[in-house]
Interface confidence: low
């Protein structure tokens, strides 16, 4: 194969791979017809002048996971056909000016996971055809104006996992073709207005795991093609009324792990493609009417682990396609009977770990497709007659860890539970809290006459088959999808991003996996 170095393997497809700790310099002679060269996991510490001079047909060069700390400016001379160059996972602290000069065909440049302290406009001024630039996992503290001005064709730029404390509003102004911009895991405290104005083709913007406290009102005003916006794990305490008003293509928005205290109506401006909205781990205390009314296609809404104590009756107006609603671990004491009335397609509702004392009889009146209801760990003493009777698809109902009052009034519920025991699961069953003489006994098998001996209680066979709710209109039957979406924590959908880990101690939270939002 035109002379393959002994420490490398060469394939008929002109691919050369050189690996191993014994390699301390670029092996020679390399096959002149090599089109792909990989130098991986070696002890090479530097690249000298023109080590690749004789392989001018090279298209892809990967020099990764080495001890590389020094490169001379002419190291890549004569590689005019090179399209892909990776120097990732080395120990580079500085890049010589002119290092990429002559790489006129270069489209992908990977410099991630090094120790780069700075970049300068001159570093990339020759790379006019570059489409992808990976700089994540370095020690960059600042990006100077002009650093990317010559990269007008760039479509993907990753600056995540650096030490950036601020961004100039002009640094991205010439990147009109950029589709993906990642700034996650930096130390950004605010983003200047206008920073993203030039990014008219941007589809993904990753700003999660920074220290952003405030979003400028028109920050995303010009990014009409944005599809994925990651703002989770920041310090955002409020959302300007118009901040999301110009994002009609958005289909993924993460805001979990911030300090949001309130959501104003209309804050989520028309987003016809948004399917999931993650708002857990904030400080939201109430939900006003119509707060989500523009999100007509929303299927998953996660509001768990907030401080919600009040939900206005019209808070969920417009969410006709919602399948999953997570409200667990909040401070809810009561709910309006109409609060879920618009959620005709709801399949799964998590209300565990609240302070609910009672539920209105019509609370689930129009939600005929409900398959799972989590009510454990509340303050419920009883439930209204017939509350679940119309829920023909209900297959999971969690009622344990409530202070059930096992007097004569509990009989209808007990009898319904007897007939529907499989729906309660086998892990934990609801037990009586009062009266004291039956405390701790299973609600399902308790003899109410023993619990309250002085009261004669007629046996009630079950809840009525067709419940009548005096103050409630009758709702038409709705068809609902029978499969439930698994609610796991949102994983940002690209590989070079650290996944958010959600604490999943089900014994503490009382959650099934489907509710661990």
């Amino acid at each position: 194969y035109h002379g393959c170095p002994s420490e490398c393997t060469c394939s008929r497809a002109s691919q050369v791979e050189c690996t191993g700790a014994r390699i301390v310099a670029v092996p020679t002679p390399l096959p002149w017809n090599a089109m792909s060269l990989q130098i991986l996991n070696t002890h090479i510490t530097e690249l000298n002048e023109s080590p690749f001079l004789n392989i001018s047909a090279l298209i892809a060069l990967r020099i990764e996971k080495n001890e590389l700390s020094r490169i001379t400016p002419g190291a890549f001379r004569n590689l005019g056909s090179l399209r892909y160059l990776s120097l990732a996972n080395n120990k580079l602290q500085v890049l010589p000016i002119g290092l990429f000069q002559g790489l006129d065909s270069l489209e992908s440049l990977l410099l991630s996971s090094n120790q780069l302290l700075q970049i300068q406009p001159a570093h990339f001024s020759q790379c006019s055809n570059l489409k992808e630039l990976q700089l994540h996992g370095n020690h960059l503290e600042y990006i100077p104006d002009g650093a990317f001005d010559h990269l007008v064709g760039l479509t993907k730029l990753n600056l995540g996992k650096n030490s950036l404390t601020h961004i100039s509003p002009r640094v991205f102004q010439h990147l009109g073709n950029l589709q993906v911009l990642r700034l996650y895991e930096n130390r950004l405290t605010d983003i200047p207005m206008g920073t993203f104005d030039g990014l008219v083709n941007l589809q993904e913007l990753a700003l999660q795991q920074n220290q952003i406290g405030l979003l400028s009102p028109g920050l995303f005003h010009n990014n009409h093609n944005l599809q994925r916006l990651y703002l989770s794990n920041n310090h955002i305490s409020q959302l300007p009324p118009s901040v999301f008003m110009q994002l009609p293509q958005l289909n993924r928005l993460t805001l979990f792990g911030n300090s949001l205290k309130e959501l104003s109506p209309g804050i989520f401006g028309p987003m016809p493609n948004l399917r999931e909205l993650w708002l857990y781990d904030n400080h939201i205390s109430s939900l006003p009417d119509n707060v989500f009314s523009n999100l007509r296609q929303l299927q998953v809404l996660i509001l768990s682990r907030n401080q919600i104590s009040f939900i206005s009756p019209g808070a969920f107006n417009g969410l006709t396609e919602l399948r999953e609603l997570s409200l667990h671990t909040n401070a809810l004491q009561d709910l309006d009977g109409n609060v879920f009335r618009m959620l005709a397609n709801l399949q799964n509702i998590s209300l565990q770990n609240n302070r609910l004392r009672q539920l209105p009889g019509n609370i689930f009146a129009n939600v005929n497709g409900l398959m799972a209801i989590q009510l454990q760990n509340n303050q419920l003493e009883n439930l209204p007659l017939g509350i679940f009777d119309h829920l023909g698809k209900l297959c999971e109902l969690r009622l344990y860890d409530n202070p059930w009052r096992c007097d004569s009034d509990i009989l209808p519920l007990r009898n319904w539970l007897l007939l529907n025991q499989p729906r309660l699961g086998t892990d934990t069953v609801p037990v009586c809290f009062s009266p004291a003489n039956v405390r701790g006994q299973s609600l399902i098998i308790i003899n109410v006459n023993v619990a309250v001996p002085s009261v004669h209680v007629p046996e009630v066979p079950s809840y009525p088959e067709t419940p009548w709710y005096p103050d409630t209109p009758s709702y038409p039957d709705t068809t609902s999808v029978s499969s439930t979406t698994e609610l796991t924590s949102p994983v940002e959908d690209y590989t070079d991003l650290t996944t958010i880990q959600v604490t999943d101690d089900r014994s503490v939270w009382g959650m099934t996996q489907a509710q661990s939002g």
């Epitope: 509003p169 207005m193 206008g194 009102p217 010009n222 110009q246 009609p248 028309p270």
Partner: antibody, heavy 116, light 107 residues
């Protein structure tokens, strides 16, 4: 009450630069965007571009090479400069408040004629 | 850029008539559409935004509807003071663009 008032010369020579200023009263220029729109005779309305108090701008691509819009927050003003004008740039020029799209307050408009 | 096409270009109707103007976008713009009224020699005035939301102070005889590519402005009962040119405007995608206008006159 929000008011906008355009000012600047009504006559500009061909190839010269058209300069207009819009003074905003009754509202802070530090909120929303601020746009210029023009109406040529019989041609309908054409958006020229907007500016934000930070200096961020967005221009109509058809005019981008000739236009610049700037803001002076201390004076609550924003300005339009259009280079290399021709007779086709003769129009009534309006400034307007851009509430992230819709224009809810407009200036009275100023007619600019390009003629030698 | 998004092109907005209004129809008709002009119309004449009697006082009290129901008048309808349509605006078609060259691509879907959700409900990011506004309507303006411009009386002769006057400044354009915002009537409706978000396709159907009436701007404060605008008479209730004006209404808007539509989403995606097809939009409608309706005047339920035409009044003499409604003589004007009406424009639709896209604010879904920059550059903001206007329709060519519909001139409304009284018979």
């Amino acid at each position: 009450q929000v008011q906008l008032q355009e000012s600047g010369p009504g006559l500009v020579k061909p190839s010269e630069t058209l300069s207009l200023t819009c003074t905003v009263s009754g509202a802070s220029i530090n909120i929303y965007y601020w746009s210029w729109i023009r109406e040529a005779s019989g041609k309908g309305l054409e958006w020229i571009g907007y500016v934000h108090h930070s200096g961020g701008t967005n221009y109509n691509p058809s005019l981008k090479s000739r236009v610049s819009i700037s803001v002076d927050t201390s004076k609550n003003q924003f300005s339009l400069r259009l280079k290399s004008v021709t007779a086709a740039d003769t129009a009534v020029y309006y400034c307007a408040r851009d509430t992230y799209g819709p224009f809810d307050y407009w200036g009275q408009g100023t007619l600019v004629t390009v003629s030698s | 850029e998004i092109v907005l096409t209004q129809s008709p270009s002009s119309l004449s109707a009697s006082v009290g008539d129901r008048v309808t103007i349509t605006c078609r976008a060259s691509q879907g713009i959700s409900n990011y559409l506004a309507w303006y009224q411009q009386k002769p020699g006057k400044v354009p005035k915002l009537l409706i935004y978000a396709a159907s939301t009436l701007q404060s102070g605008v008479p209730s005889r004006f209404s808007g509807s539509g989403s995606g590519t097809d939009f409608t402005l309706t005047v339920s009962s035409l009044q003499p003071e409604d003589v004007a040119t009406y424009y639709c405007q896209n604010y879904y995608s920059a550059p903001w663009t206007f329709g060519q206008g519909t001139k409304v006159e009284i018979k």
